[in-house]
Interface confidence: low
């Protein structure tokens, strides 16, 4: 399918002018190809009328021209001084008019209406309000005052100052008689259908002397803005319907193939399953605007979309709409990235979020889509820092690996953490993006210990368990702060073919903190990656103590915990079960027992790459 | 948490000005909504002006609009509000609040942050 996109119907009347835009992807070639207007034919040729490079047609020669506008990645066609001759269809498009680069557009113009002198032309746009205004002279102040609708050659009365009101505009139509010395009366008509256009006549008085004013209402569908994004954007519809509907609830709808509109999201609850994860409807302001927000956009969210206000939550007659037409482009600039991301209970997830490479600078956000009321998104982690303190120890947001792609690292999952989560910027917002993140049924790969106490000037280690089938992967160790995991400095131990046989005695990836100080209390995360590319991650926090005195229940020298699946002939260290811990505190009996070796000289922090034995501990 | 303290509330004649001050501590607010609510004695809590993440996007109730102005340095962690013309129905505390909520509108309920407020009267 074409990726250019504009109005499938243009309508308009004899003498007026048309302005038809046109959209395509802002590709480097699109921006400089030539552009035109062309008319198609009996034939099937379709004829150039006005094009980029310059030519107009004898047809269109002083009433056409063709605007490109390559920053935005369109183009407009203004026509003048419409004629019936007009009508017909035409194509949009770029480069050769035979290529199909196009979209066809029908054009239809129509005469005006014939209608008497003097009368005065109300143009409102359906749902909404007019108020008919009706000159009177003097002596007909105290007389009735009604105004008709023509229908054909009869006219039929709608409202009169006797309180008479036409059954079909009941609730919606008032009459006003202004005070002494004003010779107008009013009539407004609330909340305007297609039915009530035509034309009316005004009347006060009766007998030849009776005042008379013509008026021509057009009630207009509006007309749908145009909104051409990339698959996998985002799109954002601001539905502003006036101040007179404000607390009445909204919605945003979609029109089907039999022309009615299946609610999409509305302020009572409802909301289509499609958008499940993908959608906002942002809190309406005090003049009853709101907007809509989607993201993930698919190729088959295309379609013509339609907010409105109603109490029932869903389109009726005679309500205030706003329209809009949606093009999903299949030629998109957002990359391809995993709409789901799996984990298990106690595991990690990378979570790989594309934004605008142009934007490197712009601040990035994480947050998690909450469905309840009209869904909202509470930021947990932006590229300054953690927001949400619930996260502490578990979230983390980096910059790699850059150039359009940032991570977010959750660890210690749990079933509550199954949902969806938006990647945003403080930039383009066509990039909101929307990723699942589903636990499954299995073990983490990376085994840590439950969480450790570290003695206060002694040495430290703690292993970090991996299968073989991250031999090849670079595995790292870091300590956790809300602005991000700091990696510690690695020790090499051997050559770097270390794993490459991968066999029972070399999974292992150690630190050591030597000595313990105070500031090294927090969270520490073991992790493997592939270049800027990051992979699983185990959490363990670590509890610094002071130095037991003599005939403390402690006992060394020993190690670290052991990882969960290892038996540990030290006498100090007990076999301990894999925990996601959230608050340390909760498991302050579970103690790790530091080294007391001499430490002179010994690196205050660094990771090992070494077998087991070489730790002393043993592998099932 | 952010926390957050108003000042520069206090007693005006009508007509004259005032410039309110928010300032967070706790962590930077560049990723929060910021908003300025009111609170008239007997009456509900209610929204005066709204600031996003980046200040340029502004929000203000109609009775405000045109005589109030908000505004935010994030360097300084401080949001503003301008109130000129003053009325004497602008008697209140003020609160100010922050959002970390991804909303382009929010109401009262969406924010998470509050000050104790900051007293403003205007006599006539």
């Known amino acids: 399918k074409s990726p250019v996109f504009g109005p499938q119907e243009v309508s308009s009347v004899e003498g007026n002018s048309v302005s038809i835009k046109c959209y395509y992807p802002p590709t480097s070639v699109n921006r400089h190809t030539r552009k035109y207007w062309c008319r198609k034919g009996a034939s099937g040729r379709c004829i150039t009328l006005v094009s980029s490079e310059g030519y107009v047609s004898s047809n269109y020669a002083g009433r056409a021209n063709l605007t490109n506008f390559p920053e935005n990645g369109t183009f407009v066609v203004n026509i003048a001084q419409l004629s019936r001759d007009d009508s017909g269809h035409y194509k949009c498009g770029l480069g050769i008019n035979s290529r199909g680069l196009s979209f066809d557009v029908s054009l239809e113009v129509s005469q005006g209406p014939e209608l008497p002198n003097g009368t005065e032309v109300y143009t409102v746009d359906v749902g909404r309000t007019v108020t008919i205004k009706c000159p009177f002279k003097t002596e007909n102040a105290p007389k009735t005052k009604a105004l008709y609708k023509k229908i054909g050659q009869t006219s039929v009365l709608v409202i009169d100052s006797r309180n008479y009101v036409n059954p079909n505009y009941k609730d919606r139509i008032r009459l006003r008689i202004p005070g002494t010395g004003q010779l107008i009366f009013t009539v407004v008509i609330d909340r305007l259908r297609l039915s009530d256009h035509g034309l009316y006549l005004c009347q006060a008085g009766d007998g030849s002397n009776r005042d008379e004013k013509n008026a021509d209402l057009q009630v207009l569908e509006p007309e749908p803005e145009l909104v051409y994004e990339d698959l996998r954007g985002s799109v954002t519809f601001h539905c502003a319907l006036g101040l007179e509907v404000a607390n009445v609830a909204k919605f945003l709808c979609r029109v089907n193939s039999r022309e009615t509109c299946d609610v999409v999201i509305n302020t009572l609850g409802k909301r289509d399953s499609a958008f499940e994860g993908r959608i906002l409807l942002n809190p309406q302001d005090k003049d009853g605007s709101f907007s809509v927000v989607i993201t993930g956009l698919r190729k088959e969210d295309e379609g013509r979309y339609l907010c409105g206000a109603h109490s029932d939550g869903q389109l009726q007659e005679g309500w205030p709409i706003q329209a809009w037409q949606l093009f999903v482009n299949e030629e998109s600039t957002i990359p391809r990235s995993p709409t789901v991301v799996k984990g298990v209970a106690g595991g990690s997830v990378a979570v790989l979020c594309p934004y605008n490479p142009k934007e490197s600078q712009s601040l990035k956000y994480w947050c998690l889509w909450e469905g309840a009321q009209n869904g909202r998104c509470p930021l947990l982690v932006e590229s300054q820092g953690l927001v949400q303190e619930q996260y502490e120890g578990r979230l983390s947001l980096l910059q790699e690996p850059g150039n359009g792609t940032f991570t977010v690292i959750l660890n210690q999952l749990t079933t509550q953490d199954a949902g969806f989560y938006w990647c945003l910027t403080n930039g383009d917002t066509r990039w909101r993006t929307t990723v699942e993140i589903k636990i499954i049924e299995g073990e983490p790969n990376l085994k840590v210990p439950g969480n450790v106490t570290a003695v206060l000037g002694e040495t430290l280690n703690i292993p970090c368990h991996f299968p073989c089938k991250f031999s090849s992967y670079e595995k790292y160790w870091c300590k956790w702060s809300n602005t991000g995991c700091q990696t510690l400095p690695s020790q090499d131990e051997g050559p770097s073919e270390a794993f490459v046989n991968c066999d029972e005695n070399s999974r292992l990836v150690s630190l050591t903190l030597n000595p313990v100080t105070r500031a090294d209390e927090g969270w520490y995360w073991c992790g493997v990656k592939q270049g800027h590319f990051y992979g699983e991650t185990a959490a363990v926090y670590v509890a610094v103590e002071e130095k037991k005195v003599a005939g403390s229940r402690y006992v060394s020298p020993a190690k670290a915990d052991a990882a969960p699946d290892e038996k540990v002939l030290d006498s100090g260290v007990r076999e301990i079960e894999n925990k996601a811990i959230q608050d340390p505190r909760l498991f302050a009996e579970e103690k790790v027992v530091a080294d007391t070796g001499d430490q002179a000289g010994g690196s205050r922090a660094s990771v090992d790459s070494s077998s087991s034995e070489e730790q002393g501990g043993s592998s099932k | 948490e952010v926390q957050l303290v108003e000042s520069g509330g206090g007693l005006v004649q009508a007509g004259g000005s005032l410039r309110l001050s928010c300032a967070a501590s706790?962590?930077?607010?560049?990723?929060?909504?910021m908003g300025w609510f009111r609170q008239a004695p007997g009456k509900e809590r209610e929204f005066v002006a709204r600031i996003d993440w980046s200040g340029s996007s502004t929000d203000y109730a109609d009775s405000v609009k045109g005589r109030f102005t908000i505004s935010r340095d994030n360097a300084k962690n401080t949001v503003y509000l301008q109130m000129n013309s003053l009325k004497p129905e602008d008697t209140a505390v003020y609160y100010c609040a922050g959002s970390a909520y991804y909303s382009g509108y929010v109401t009262h309920r969406d924010f998470g942050s509050w000050g104790q407020g900051t007293l403003v009267t205007v006599s006539s």
């Open positions: 706790g962590r930077t607010i560049n990723t929060y909504v």
